[in-house]
Structures are given as structure tokens and as C-alpha cells.
């Protein structure tokens, strides 16, 4: 089970353009909070360690997933060609 948590913004930092959110999940051993089908989910911890983000199936069904350069995140390509980017910090 997972819930989305919005992190308090650090007032010492300039306004970030990407919301600082994380998923709080109760996961089994060997799993960790991630994203599956655009929703928070428990995923295999090895995916996070190896940064093979697309193995989480983070995009919606019918969308294509690609890793960003340096595996800093992933993109989801919608059937019509719009691309959504998620970076991992």
C-alpha cells in the first residue's frame, strides 16, 4: 500500500519547478517505493539500485518508456507523441 506525500519546501532554496513529492509505502522485504502505471507502488529494490527505471513499468499502458541519459530518470511517450519526463533525485 502506498500514499503520496508532498515534502515541505526548504525555504532556503529558490522555488523549484518540479513538485517535491515522494511515495510512502509499506513494502515487503526486498521491495521499495517506486512507480508502476503512473502510481506509487512497491517495486523490486534491484530496479532502484541499478536505475533500470523502466523495469518498474512506470508509464501508463500503451505508453513507451525510455531511460534518460545517465539513468537520471525516465520518459513516458504517449501514443500521440507527447513526452512526460520524470527525474529521480
Amino acid at each position: 500500500t502506498c500514499e503520496i506525500v508532498t515534502l515541505d519546501r526548504d525555504s532556503s532554496q529558490p522555488r523549484r519547478t518540479i513538485a517535491r513529492q515522494t511515495a510512502r509505502c509499506a513494502c515487503r522485504k526486498g521491495q521499495i517505493a517506486g512507480t508502476t502505471r503512473a502510481r506509487p507502488a512497491c517495486v523490486d529494490a534491484r530496479i532502484i539500485k541499478t536505475k533500470q527505471w523502466c523495469d518498474m513499468l512506470p508509464c501508463l499502458e500503451g505508453e513507451g518508456c525510455d531511460l534518460l541519459i545517465n539513468r537520471s530518470g525516465w520518459t513516458c511517450t504517449q501514443p500521440g507523441g507527447r513526452i512526460k519526463t520524470t527525474t529521480v533525485s
Epitope: 518540479i18 520518459t75 507523441g81
Partner: antibody, heavy 114, light 113 residues
Framework: QEQLVESGGRLVTPGTTLTLTCTVS????????VSWVRQAPGKGLEWIGY??????PHYASWAKGRFTISKTSSTTVDLKMTSLTTEDTATYFC?????????WGPGTLVTVSS | ELDLTQTPSSVSAAVGGTVTINCQAS????????LAWYQQKPGQPPKLLIY???TLASGVSSRFKGSGSGTQFTLTISDVQCDDAATYYC?????????????FGGGTELEIL
């Protein structure tokens, strides 16, 4: 700090072709798409088109044929407008288009008048 | 034709009050939730308030709340402040293959009494 700045807006006569440039910093155009939006004086926002990070452009139905969006470098996206009319007088904005449009540039004013 | 209808076109509210703005799409937005809300003040570019129908953008006050899915969406501003005087726009995302990728509502002007 992620930023976008538009340039190229000026006073032109009807029928002119004009190219606006959106220069980005603080993020990579290889990772994010950009939309162009315009706003006529005292009016609402009107979406013109979008270019994905794979160089694939999409246009509003009313903008197809007369407007062209292209990536011209690793930090710039151009909006080419042909056969301008007085109806095209507006402030033109570019914005990073991802989960919502954010951030936006300050805009550049295009005035079409004879 | 793709259309986002915003109501009302203008609204007045007293400081401390609550304002509700509605946005209706002529067809379902992508994934039923790809709708954003913006605040724009004169002479400034729009500022993202909410994306994915209900997710608050970074640095935005929790007084702003988005809700809805499919074709019907609502922006609620609670404990209205003088600084909230602005025009508010909804923006829907649609499948680029079947329609325009994006469309904006006509805007709602908020006046503080």
C-alpha cells in the same frame, strides 16, 4: 535555476513572416518538451503548439500550416509565423511542457499593424 | 471541436472567503486527470498552481485545491487573500493523435472585495 526567455517580437506589417526564439537554461531540451502559447491584449491564453524532446512537433488545429516549431540548437526552440495578420497581435510565451507548463518565459510582444 | 468551458468568467470574494471555479472539457482529458490550473496577474506570465487535476505545484499555498476527473474539474481557493486577485485558467491535455494536445479555458477573473 530553470528559465526560458523569448525574443524576436516586434512591430511588423500584415503578410510578414516572423521567427521568435525561446532560449532555455537550467534544463535540457533533450529531456523536456516546450509549448508556445499566445495571449492577445486583454484576452485569454491560446495554445499554439508543442515540440517534444525527440523533435516531434504538434500544433493546434488553427495553427497548422502557418506556424512552425523547431529546435534550432541544444538551448533554443523557434516559432516561425507566416502571413501574419492583425489577429496575430499578442504576447507570445514559451513554457516547459511536462506535468503542467512550468516555468514560463516573460513573453515577447508581436504587433501586426499597417 | 476541443473546448474547455470555465465558469464563472468573473467572481468576487471577501478576504477569508472561499471561491470555486469550474472547468468543463468537451471530451475527457488524457488519463482522465491531465488538467492543470494557472494564476496570472497583469503583465506577468501564468504561474502553475495545480497539475494532474489535484497535485499542488511546488511552492504553492495549500489554500489552493484541485479536484475532478474526466471532463469536470474544480479549483477551490479557501481563506482568500488580497494577493489572490488574478485571472485563473484551466488547461487540459489531450491525446495528440486524436485532437489538439492542449487547450485552455477562457479564464476566470477573481476580484477581492
Amino acid at each position: 535555476q530553470e528559465q526560458l526567455v523569448e525574443s524576436g517580437g516586434r512591430l511588423v506589417t500584415p503578410g510578414t513572416t516572423l521567427t521568435l526564439t525561446c532560449t532555455v537554461s537550467g534544463f535540457s531540451l533533450s529531456s523536456y518538451g516546450v509549448s508556445w502559447v499566445r495571449q492577445a491584449p486583454g484576452k485569454g491564453l491560446e495554445w499554439i503548439g508543442y515540440i517534444a524532446n525527440n523533435y516531434n512537433p504538434h500544433y493546434a488545429s488553427w495553427a497548422k500550416g502557418r506556424f512552425t516549431i523547431s529546435k534550432t540548437s541544444s538551448t533554443t526552440v523557434d516559432l516561425k509565423m507566416t502571413s501574419l495578420t492583425t489577429e496575430d497581435t499578442a504576447t507570445y510565451f514559451c513554457a516547459r511542457d511536462n506535468y503542467g507548463m512550468d516555468p514560463w518565459g516573460p513573453g515577447t510582444l508581436v504587433t501586426v499593424s499597417s | 471541436e476541443l473546448d474547455l468551458t470555465q465558469t464563472p468568467s468573473s467572481v468576487s470574494a471577501a478576504v477569508g472567503g472561499t471561491v470555486t471555479i469550474n472547468c468543463q472539457a468537451s471530451q475527457s482529458v488524457y488519463n482522465n486527470k491531465n488538467l492543470a490550473w494557472y494564476q496570472q496577474k497583469p503583465g506577468q506570465p501564468p504561474k502553475l498552481l495545480i497539475y494532474a487535476a489535484s497535485t499542488l505545484a511546488s511552492g504553492v499555498s495549500s489554500r489552493f485545491k484541485g479536484s475532478g476527473s474526466g471532463t469536470q474539474f474544480t479549483l477551490t481557493i479557501s481563506d482568500v487573500q488580497c494577493d489572490d486577485a488574478a485571472t485563473y485558467y484551466c488547461q487540459g491535455e489531450f491525446s495528440c493523435s486524436s485532437a489538439d494536445c492542449n487547450a485552455f479555458g477562457g479564464g476566470t477573473e477573481l476580484e477581492i472585495l
